[in-house]
């Protein structure tokens, strides 16, 4: 056969679906890869063919799309799982092509197990919620296309085990699931089970989410500097080791970068000379607000160095802000004997 | 540029109604505090209230509690500040300001003065 | 509420010379994530007020090295190292540990 556009195997797009539920999967050429859409491909005169490898198989092999009921079909650029088994799971490849023309990705699909508390190996969705925020949603995820609009499913919502009814601050509104205040209390996973009739059968459709309750930006403050400070004197003598903490609190803030840095004399330690290491810690409250730690480290300071500016800074989207560490030379002790001697005329 | 430009001064007879306007431009203005601060003639200055755009959650000085309405429209990036019934003692300097995190008020406005007399 | 009390409420100073303000709050405005919540502020004559000093201790961007603010808990002061002619004006000290955010009364500085 000829040349064909091979993207190889797009482990970014691992796929997972739940045994016995209905799937949809898109080929992933259009979404990712080629810079028009399936009708488009349509109206040209190129043809979509799917094929797979069965997990643990080298081997690939058309998709029996002649399945009692249909179980697997194609509809335009999808690929219908109505419903999933578990022997599914494989390497699934999407080819476009026609007499001049071929491109084709191949992606991980996986079938999974779910547990009656819906607990399984697939990986969950993160929704943060802030706390203490007033009414917030989360949305049941990933349904569209699964039925027409004309047809009203069911939705029953879980948290972990347990189906939502009378909770105190959490409401099922149909696809959404409100909250009126969020506490750390609502941290955990929630399920959707979405129930809808498909010529004369029955589907469930199964999406679990974790929730994160994290600080609010109602409550958000510019970073602060909690080392060095103005209480903290570092005194050292030529030969001993530096150690200056910088230690910066970070509100959460929802896609802030937080950062921390040193200058010394004004300029970063990788642009100077001197023998600098600095170690970096990051720890996390309940709320995701941050703690962030660079221990500034220069192992024989020379009295040069102590007359250097030692300057921490931290900047997040609320704002930067910089502390001078307060860094001096220690004035040695009078050896007795000899100065202290000579101060009463010894000789 | 970052800036909060208040709607102009404003002279008013004692029982009328009155809205002034700030309105936040150069940054999201969902995103931040807008409080609103009172300076009588030759006084101080008085923290009255509080609104986050984003949601309207609104909170008031008790010495302000009950006597203004703080709202805010995000559509058009506005806060606003509202009387049914004025008084005499009404009368100041009204300042909007926003607070970027904790308290810290770091742009303001240039003022709206309000003078209430029969 | 809590209350904020500045002293002294007038500071006649000469430019050149370092001067202080007190602020003094009727509880502490240490928030348990280790920041004190008090902000000062200056307003120079015919104008808004203009953010100084956030957070106890950090300065506002555009304000000069020459004012540091300090303290924690519930006793904060505003120093500026060297007074300038420009810096007179009223400064006023404010709590923002509840929502409930309250002002000093105020310091009047001014030049001898």
């Known amino acids: 056969s000829e040349r064909c556009d091979d993207w190889g195997l797009d482990t970014m797009r691992q796929i997972q679906v739940f045994e016995d539920e209905p799937a949809r999967i898109k080929c992933p050429l259009f979404e990712h890869f080629l810079k028009f859409n399936y009708s488009t491909a349509h109206s040209a005169g190129l043809t979509l063919i799917w094929y797979w490898t069965r997990q643990d198989r080298d081997l690939e092999e058309p998709i029996n799309f002649r399945l009692p009921e249909n179980r697997i079909s194609k509809e335009k650029d999808v690929l219908w799982f109505r419903p999933t088994l578990l022997n599914d799971t494989g390497n699934y490849t999407c080819m476009l092509r026609n007499t001049t023309y071929c491109s084709k990705v191949a992606f991980p699909l996986e079938v999974v197990q779910k547990d009656s508390c819906f607990n399984s190996p697939m990986k969950l969705p993160v929704h943060k919620l802030y706390i203490e925020y007033g009414i917030q949603r989360i949305t049941c995820p990933n349904v569209d296309g699964y039925f027409p609009s004309s047809v009203k499913p069911t939705i029953t919502w879980y948290m972990g085990c347990y189906k939502i009814q009378n909770f105190n601050n959490v409401i099922p509104e149909g696809m959404n699931l409100s909250f009126l205040i969020a506490l750390i209390s609502n941290n955990g996973n929630y399920t959707c089970v979405v129930t809808y009739p498909e010529n004369g059968r029955t589907f469930h459709l199964t999406r679990t989410l974790t929730v994160k309750v994290v600080g609010s930006p109602k409550n958000a403050v510019p970073p602060v500097i909690h080392s060095p400070n103005d209480h903290v004197v570092y005194e050292k003598e030529p030969g001993e080791e530096l150690l200056i903490p910088c230690t910066v609190y970070f509100s959460f803030l929802m896609d802030s970068r937080n950062e921390v840095w040193w200058t010394i004399d004004g300029k970063k330690p990788d642009d100077i000379t001197i023998d600098v290491t600095i170690n970096e810690s990051i720890s996390h409250s309940r709320t995701e607000d941050e703690t962030r730690t660079q221990i500034l480290s220069i192992k024989k300071v020379t009295s040069e160095d102590l007359k250097r500016s030692y300057v921490c800074h931290a900047r997040s989207a609320k704002g930067e802000v910089a502390k001078a560490a307060k860094v001096k030379q220690k004035v040695p002790a009078p050896r007795y004997t000899v100065e202290l001697a000579c101060g009463f005329g010894a000789t | 540029e970052v800036q909060l430009v208040q709607s102009g001064a404003e002279v008013k007879k004692p029982g009328e109604s009155l809205k002034i306007s700030c309105k936040g431009s150069g940054y999201s203005f969902t995103s931040y505090w807008i409080g609103w601060v009172r300076q009588m003639p030759g006084k101080g200055l008085e923290w009255m209230g509080i609104?986050?755009?984003?949601?309207?959650?609104?909170r008031y000085s008790p010495s302000f509690q009950g006597q203004v309405t703080i709202s805010a429209d995000k559509s058009v990036n506005t806060a606003y500040l509202q009387w049914i019934s004025l008084k005499a003692s009404d009368t100041a300097i009204y300042y909007c300001a926003r607070s970027s995190g904790g308290t810290a008020m770091d742009v303001w406005g240039q003022g709206t003065t309000v003078t209430v007399s029969s | 509420d809590i209350v904020m009390t500045q002293s002294p409420l007038s500071l006649p100073v000469t430019p050149g010379e370092p001067a202080s303000i007190s602020c003094r709050s009727s509880q502490s405005l240490l928030h348990s994530n280790g920041y004190n919540t008090l902000d000062w502020y200056l307003q120079k004559p015919g104008q808004s007020p203009q953010l100084l000093i956030y957070l106890g201790s950090n300065r506002a961007s555009g304000v000069p090295d020459r004012f540091s603010g300090s303290g924690s808990g519930t006793d904060f002061t505003l120093k500026i190292s060297r007074v300038e002619a420009e810096d007179v004006g009223l400064y006023y000290c404010?709590?923002?540990?509840?929502?409930?955010?309250?002002f000093g009364q105020g310091t009047r500085v001014e030049i001898k």
């Open positions: 404010m709590q923002g540990l509840q929502t409930q955010w309250t």
């Open positions: 609104i986050w755009p984003g949601d309207s959650d609104t």
